[in-house]
């Protein structure tokens, strides 16, 4: 912690501006007001500080409001940002864009996905839901940056939107995420014929039930790969060969190359042996031939 | 030895169709799948499509989907591409290739089909 | 369709130097599961049939020389031949097999300088 010191009258700061990167350390913690420095807050990113100097205006900061910084001076935070911790964050209350969006730029190329995750977080809650607007800013700022966000804030996306999210700003959403996505996508592309349905719906396709992967596989959608490897386990077990021909189409001919891999692995090993001969692939490990599979979770269940 | 043997140089007429060969040996038949990819003379190259030779269901790029036809022999391990309804930019060498797994692993010589009236 | 732009459309280089082709896909071609990215390299050398050099980005085929490396991830590829040799002229192309129509670049010729 900096020392307490008192400031020389001729060091006394009544305006932040650049002759402030010349005091030290303890000269910055003794000579500037914190109020002064909340006031003032637009000027600081312009101020080519120190790291160690950020250290001692954040320490001013942190003492000046307890409890969280008001957003008047989260919008001006600039370079400053990179100084916060997520608990720092967690107790702040944000609610507008232009801030978000000016401190998704100050993290641009730094390692915070702790602190963006943490912030957006507080300005779902801010906002009191994920609305459009918010979606629009986080794809255009943060690519994937949706899915940092939790299943519970995720609900909160109404249908409507859905419509802004693109493909890439699902590829980090685990199977949770989409599990709450996937229904309000569902929904939100109804109305729309086979092909563009499945076009849309494919991003969001990790959330599926098996009905619906079922049902995907009678509409020649020809499922790429990556897709089907997104897919819960739970929806691809009970799959049959001929359905998984039909759902992949020309991408079946993958699966040698990812058979090694969850689902696919567990895929095969449930499938009779002839069965999965009939894709051409030198698949192995299937049930052999006159072997009889007995489901003992049903027994179970029962008793 | 992996190996792919294409049938002869072909001319056609505007209008008429080609059956291209390729025959396989040098592995088990049915365990990999072919593909068709053509090259117009000084171009890229162009996938139209490939084949399970098991069970003989093909999938083709839907820029040929009305003209082209895959189909398999598996008595003599041949695959066969037809193209109907030809047309001077069909003129091009005409390729079958073994898949490794997606991408193509093993090429024949190409048949080269040329479209003149 | 996933359109794959390479770059640049020939080079020349002397015997011996790197040579570095860049391929550049319209959308990712990494499978996020299995961490394998679906681009495999062909060098087509001149009146003849096209051959494997690489998969899944980075895998060099058995039997393809080491100066040939892969590398790159999610829409952005480079293909790098280490020191030059005679032998080496020919078209290269990059084609992901990630969906259908699987798609190739438009090639890029290497040339002695």
């Known amino acids: 912690d900096v020392e307490r010191t008192t400031c020389p009258p001729e060091k006394e700061v009544h305006e932040i501006d650049e002759s402030l990167i010349f005091y030290k350390k303890r000269e910055l913690e003794a000579c500037v007001d914190a109020a002064l420095l909340a006031a003032q807050m637009d000027r600081v990113d312009a101020i080519p500080f120190t790291y160690e100097q950020l250290d001692v205006l954040k320490h001013k900061l942190d003492e000046l409001y307890p409890q969280g910084y008001p957003e008047s001076v989260i919008r001006h935070l600039g370079h400053l940002f990179l100084k916060m911790s997520p608990e720092d964050i967690r107790k702040w209350n944000v609610t507008s864009l232009e801030t978000l969006k000016a401190l998704l730029k100050v993290s641009k190329g730094h390692e915070m996905s702790a602190q963006v995750a943490t912030l957006i977080d507080r300005v779902v809650v801010g906002r009191g839901q994920l609305d459009k607007d918010t979606v629009d800013t986080l794809t255009a700022f943060c690519p994937g940056c949706l899915c940092s966000l939790s299943p519970e804030r995720l609900s909160s996306v109404p249908p409507s939107v859905i419509g802004a999210v693109r493909p890439q700003d699902l590829d980090t959403c685990g199977p949770r995420q989409l599990d709450v996505l996937y229904p309000k996508a569902r929904l939100a592309f109804q109305n729309m014929s086979g092909s563009e349905y499945f076009v849309k719906i494919r991003p969001f396709l990790g959330g599926a039930p098996t009905e619906d992967v079922k049902a995907l596989s009678q509409q020649n959608v020809s499922m790429d790969l990556a897709t089907f490897m997104k897919l819960r386990r739970e929806a691809v077990l009970p799959l049959t060969v001929a359905e998984v021909q039909k759902l992949l189409g020309p991408h079946v001919e993958g699966l040698k190359v990812e058979e090694q891999h969850s689902p696919v692995r567990d895929w095969i090993l449930k499938q009779r042996q002839d069965d999965l001969d009939t894709l051409g692939l030198g698949l192995q490990g299937g049930i052999p031939n006159g072997y009889l599979i007995l489901d003992l979770s049903v027994r179970e269940a029962l008793s | 030895e992996v190996q792919l043997v294409q049938s002869g140089a072909e001319v056609k007429k505007p209008g008429a169709s080609v059956k291209v060969s390729c025959k396989a040996s040098g592995y088990t038949f049915t365990n990999y799948w072919m593909h068709w990819v053509r090259q117009a003379p000084g171009q890229g190259l162009e996938w139209m499509g490939n084949i399970n030779p098991s069970s003989g269901d093909s999938y083709y790029n839907e820029r040929f989907m009305s003209r082209v036809t895959m189909t398999v022999d598996k008595s003599t391990s041949t695959v066969y591409m037809e193209l109907s309804s030809l047309r001077s930019e069909d003129t091009a060498v005409y390729y079958c290739?073994?898949?490794?797994?997606?991408?193509?692993?093993?090429w024949g010589q190409g048949t080269l089909v040329t479209v003149s009236s | 369709d996933i359109v794959m732009t390479q770059s640049p459309d020939s080079l020349a280089v002397s015997l011996g130097e790197r040579a570095t082709i860049n391929c550049k896909s319209s959308q990712t071609l990494l499978n996020s599961v299995s961490q394998n990215n679906y681009l495999a390299w062909y060098q087509q050398k001149p009146g003849q049939s096209p051959t494997l050099l690489i998969y899944?980005?980075?895998t060099r085929e058995s039997g393809v020389p080491d100066r040939f490396s892969g590398s790159g991830s999610g829409t952005d590829f480079t293909l790098t031949i280490s020191s030059l040799q005679a032998e080496d002229v020919a078209v290269y192309y990059c084609q992901q097999h990630y969906r259908t129509p699987y798609t190739f670049g438009g090639g890029t010729k290497v040339e002695i300088k």
């Open positions: 290739a073994r898949s490794g797994g997606l991408w193509l692993a093993f």
């Open positions: 899944f980005a980075s």
